[in-house]
């Protein structure tokens, strides 16, 4: 019988008392085969973290700083359940740390040196740890003691709770630096008042502070937020302009064997019976013998943290960077304006080999990081382990939802001004064998399908989006008799046709022979009835252009396109017979790396781009014999995006809407995780 007990860790007598009450009340409402609570008492949160790691306890609720500690080796804990605040309809699990300034003050984030600063309090998250952590490497050396470095960075500050004797500059704007509401500039509202009164130039607070202190929009319009990319935005655009997004209060558990489903089952049932306004006898979010015992008193309920989300992703790149800077205190030798090497994310070993050759030829401007799937690569770019990669539009959508930005677009047509003219896109098509003459768009049910990969534009999002509109359900594996759609569940009929061996079967990378455009076309040639690819795929793999044994004798005339009106046309008539226009593949990165990725890639394509004529004796960035490694092989150049520099603008309203409609069919664990952080 599986043990269905969750051992909750308590850090005080009062918490232990509430835990026992929680245990007893849960027993009275949950059947005997349901989850139960046991209480473990420890002296501190750090002791609780160690106890959970050692399997002496299972769960504890922590604020963000401790979630970071819990994640560090050897603890390796992960977030499993988040408290939410506000309403069930609009649950808030995060707050945003922001830098507020007056509208007419005219400086940016990188010009804070010598300004006057207002902080909520020394050592507090939004008011100190996050801004000072992010500014850490700009502080004058020596950076220890930290208070002295901060005092020398700003021309004057109010940092309540600082030592006014040792660091008088930190108390210059609020004499005495009082550590309570007796100091008018203490806390969130106090720090904002410090800015409002004109004492300081910038206030480090949370996003709701300005709304709580200024009910009138006209008054709020006198203020702006400083963004990390050295721009400013209105105060209501905090989701796109903040220092960090911080989880409020989170239940953590072991990463392996951590009982996360059981913990959720327990807490979900607990909130049903003892949540806000549910019971008089016992209230989960109330602490008669103290404050915030086990859970925050202000919490309204719990939300399950998506399983794909580790602590790094949950806390976010900015928060992790800030806390790591403060804890480890390490900075690059000398902060220069020169770009660091770009860490390119390569999928599986074929891409890694090409990336390594690029790295050698770039003389260290490019470094390589490997991952097994595109989503793993996107996650690595999010958390800073990698910097950039080129993605199909479907993954540009996921990357965008995860906070990444497009920086350059692949262009596939030769033109005089290639780098300055991003193209409108390519065509997503459905290809069939000419010999299967009765096959049309309207009778695909029960046929064998070949897809580039789940989540990709031409191979999945466009055809399956159109199909969804017709069949109104997501059971595509029942619609087709079998197929190969790399990235599907291994037991799905949409992995049945795939050719990868062992664990590589149906993997969304080049280890699966039917992956990508060329792979999907090969699947059609060898096993399938229809392949969903791009309009260039057939000509690129016929007429001897692909020397591989399966392709070398193929003839373009033996294939036709399915048109949406139920007719068929020759392959060259794609402009009048396609499923939709697809946005070109694009390079994505984090916002903070955008300028450097742009600069280095433009240098690299001038050295190794399509101007290189002999690829047998030279490195060619856009060549890999139809394998589309790192970039599509038909890329002519990487083009500037001009103003299409967000995923929505780049992909276009129509495509974003189409993918949004398919979201209900999405199996993307990463998309689920990212929409948890930003619904």
């Amino acid at each position: 019988v599986p043990d269905k007990t969750v051992r909750w860790c308590a850090v005080s007598e009062h918490e232990a008392t509430k835990c026992q009450s929680f245990r007893d009340h849960m027993k009275s409402v949950i059947p005997s085969d349901g989850p139960s609570v046991a209480c473990v008492k420890k002296a501190s949160y750090l002791d609780c973290i160690r106890a959970i790691a050692a399997n002496e306890a299972d769960a504890v609720t922590l604020d963000a700083g401790l979630v970071y500690d819990a994640y560090l080796a050897p603890n390796n804990l992960k977030p499993v359940v988040a408290e939410f605040y506000g309403s069930k309809e609009d649950p808030q699990t995060f707050y945003y740390a922001v830098a507020v300034v007056k509208k007419d003050s005219g400086f940016q984030m990188n010009q804070l040196r010598g300004k006057k600063s207002c902080h909520t309090g020394l050592g507090r998250s939004a008011g100190w740890n996050i801004p000072i952590g992010l500014l850490y490497c700009d502080l004058p050396e020596p950076r220890k003691p930290l208070e002295k470095a901060v005092a020398n960075f700003f021309s004057g500050s109010c940092a309540p709770c600082a030592d006014g004797t040792d660091f008088p500059q930190l108390c210059q704007l609020c004499p005495g630096c009082g550590c309570s509401t007796l100091n008018q500039y203490f806390g969130y509202s106090g720090a904002f008042k410090c800015l409002k009164d004109g004492a300081g130039d910038v206030a480090f607070v949370k996003h709701s502070t300005i709304f709580e202190n200024l009910a009138n929009k006209a008054d709020r319009d006198q203020y702006e937020l400083l963004c990390l990319d050295n721009t400013r935005k209105p105060v209501d655009e905090y989701k796109d302009c903040h220092l960090a997004q911080v989880p409020s209060h989170t239940v953590v558990a072991r990463s392996m064997g951590g009982k996360e489903d059981l913990i959720w089952e327990l807490l979900n049932q607990a909130q049903e019976h003892f949540g806000k306004d549910k019971s008089k006898e016992f209230q989960l979010f109330s602490s008669p013998h103290g404050k915030d015992l086990l859970f925050k008193d202000s919490a309204h309920g719990f939300l399950k943290v998506p399983p794909r989300m580790d602590a790094k992703m949950y806390l976010g790149y900015e928060y992790v960077t800030a806390i790591r800077n403060l804890r480890e205190g390490t900075c690059p030798e000398a902060p220069t304006d020169e770009c660091k090497p770009v860490k390119w994310c390569a999928l599986s070993h074929h891409e890694r080999l090409k990336c390594d050759e690029w790295s050698v030829n770039s003389v260290g401007k490019i470094e390589c990081v490997s991952a097994e799937t595109t989503e793993d690569c996107i996650a690595k770019i999010m958390n800073g382990e990698a910097d950039a990669m080129s993605l199909d539009g479907g993954f540009v959508y996921i990357a965008g939802k995860c906070g990444l930005v497009p920086v350059l677009a692949e262009n596939y047509n030769k033109s005089d001004n290639c780098e300055d003219t991003p193209e409108a896109g390519y065509f997503a098509i459905a290809v069939v064998k000419k010999s299967a003459s009765d096959l049309t768009w309207d009778n695909l049910k029960g046929k064998k399908s070949c897809h580039t990969a789940v989540g990709r534009t031409a191979g999945w999002n466009i055809p399956m989006g159109l199909l969804y509109n017709k069949i109104n359900h997501c059971r595509f594996d029942e619609f087709f008799s079998e197929g190969c759609a790399p990235g599907s569940k291994k037991d799905s009929s949409l992995c049945k046709l795939c050719m990868g061996s062992g664990l590589n079967l149906c993997e969304p990378n080049n280890k699966e022979g039917y992956y990508g455009y060329t792979g999907a076309f090969r699947c059609l040639v060898e096993k399938g009835d229809v392949a969903f690819v791009k309009h260039q795929t057939v000509p690129q793999n016929t007429g001897g252009k692909n020397p591989d044994p399966w392709a070398k004798n193929l003839n373009e005339k033996d294939y036709e396109l399915l048109c949406l009106d139920g007719t068929r046309k020759p392959v060259e008539e794609y402009a009048n017979c396609h499923l939709a226009r697809a946005p070109n593949h694009a390079v994505v990165t984090r916002k903070d790396k955008e300028a450097c990725v742009h600069k280095i890639l433009r240098q690299q394509q001038h050295l190794f781009g399509s101007n290189v004529t002999d690829c047998s004796g030279n490195f060619c960035l856009f060549r890999s014999e139809t394998k589309d490694l790192l970039f599509r092989d038909d890329t002519v150049c990487l083009a500037k995006l001009h103003d299409r520099n967000t995923y929505e603008k780049y992909l276009g309203e129509e495509y974003v809407k189409a993918v949004g409609n398919l979201r209900k069919c999405s199996t993307s664990s990463l998309l689920e995780a990212c929409t948890f952080r930003r619904p």
Epitope: H350, L353, V360, V363, N618, F619
Partner: nanobody, 117 residues
Amino acid sequence: EVQLVECGGGLVQPGGSLRLSCAASGSIASINTMAWYRQAPGQQRELVAGITRGGSTNYADSVKGRFTISRDNAKNTLYLQMNSLKPEDTAVYYCTDYSRGYYQDYWGQGTQVTVSS
């Protein structure tokens, strides 16, 4: 198609040196990029050092300042001079020229380097 054969490995004490050679069965003058990789037990194969036809070199951070890659096109040989060896340099070392099969996995036998006291 050029075949590559690695040699020069062996057992060496920490702090010691070794010089690995990679002999090609044909001309390497037209081959753009050549490189040394290594694979420790249970680890992924990783790039150690690479060199282009023009003589530009690149090294993994872990070996910078200790290892030197070079090529002799006249002798059709790639070299890796390894100084100040550490126990963590223990691995099988392979050379490659990237030119075969467009990034398919074609590896020779490699040569074992063991750094131990």
